[in-house]
């Protein structure tokens, strides 16, 4: 069985303040079953950015329909970017369970925010 890969193709993304940022993430396999979550930062303090199954993420939307069968694209779009959104974002695969078990993280995408052009 091929090892699951979580692919974040861009090491960095630069966005002007006020614009939307797309953070790309795909997985190489549908197995094992379990959710993808997005975080900002690493370690115990990492911030939850997007979780499909629950939570309040008013500025974050999935690029593809994550409920669609055989979906392997878990990219997200963050709207109305501000300097406070800068940081490194990680796409993380979990195995379904009680609780879900973290399996693999993408390498991370660093989001930088440029001043809005005048």
């Amino acid at each position: 069985e091929e090892e699951l890969q979580v692919i974040q193709p861009e090491k960095s993304v630069s966005v002007a303040a006020g614009d939307s940022a797309t953070l790309n993430c795909t997985v190489s396999s549908l197995i094992p079953v379990g959710p993808i979550q997005w975080f900002r930062g690493a370690g115990p303090g990492r911030e939850l950015i997007y979780n499909l199954k629950e939570g309040h993420f008013p500025r974050v939307t999935a690029v593809s329909d994550p409920t669609k069968r055989n979906n392997m694209d878990f990219s997200i779009r963050i709207s109305n970017i501000t300097p406070a959104d800068a940081g490194t974002y990680y796409c993380v695969k979990f195995r379904k369970g009680s609780p879900d078990v973290e399996l693999k993280s993408g390498a991370g995408t660093e989001l930088s925010v440029r001043a809005k052009p005048s």
């Epitope: 930062g41 303090g45 939850l48 309040h56 609780p99 973290e102």
Partner: antibody
Amino acid sequence: DVQLVESGGGLVRPGESLRLSCAASGFTFTNYAVTWVRQAPGEGLEWVSLISVTGTTYYADSVKGRFTISRDNSKSTLYLQMNGLRAEDTAVYYCAKVTWKNVFDYWGLGTLVTVSS
Amino acid sequence: EIVLTQSPGTLSVSPGERATFSCRASQTVGSKLAWYQQKPGQAPRLLIYDANTRATGIPARFSGSRSGTEFTLTISSLQSEDFAVYYCQQHTDWPPYTFGGGTKVEIK
């Protein structure tokens, strides 16, 4: 405005238990790790425990096996169950919100725990 | 475990003067060092993280710098509300999250 309000402190005897609560408001509680930090009278700050957004728990060696951190996301509340309390656990216990940088950006006012016979 | 040593333990400064104190890490923490201010009877307040980035709402008179494993917090012109205890904290190696022993800034 972000607010963290601790409760549950008090005077207990060595070996007894206490459960601290921290009610959070003004931010999306489920999206952030939260932590407990304590301060003995006249002393500095000592990190006690942290619970991540996914529920992973971390403890200082001094409390491992005696204290249990938990969170109830539906109530936006953080807890610290303290068993087998010792005199050296006497302190003001603060809860704090953790940023993705692993620093503590908002703190409660604290609740005093006194362990004495 | 990373040990943080703050010096001096107490600093006596007159209002309007510059205050500088340090925090030395027992091993490398990169730039992952934060500073907190605590006034008597109050909770700590985050001032600086990543060695030199001011937290939201912190006045520009507070600045941080790094030289290797030695970190410095400078208050350019002390105001009456700045007399407090200042703690450093490393945020690179966890757990545990470790704090320095504190520097008390008192009125001269």
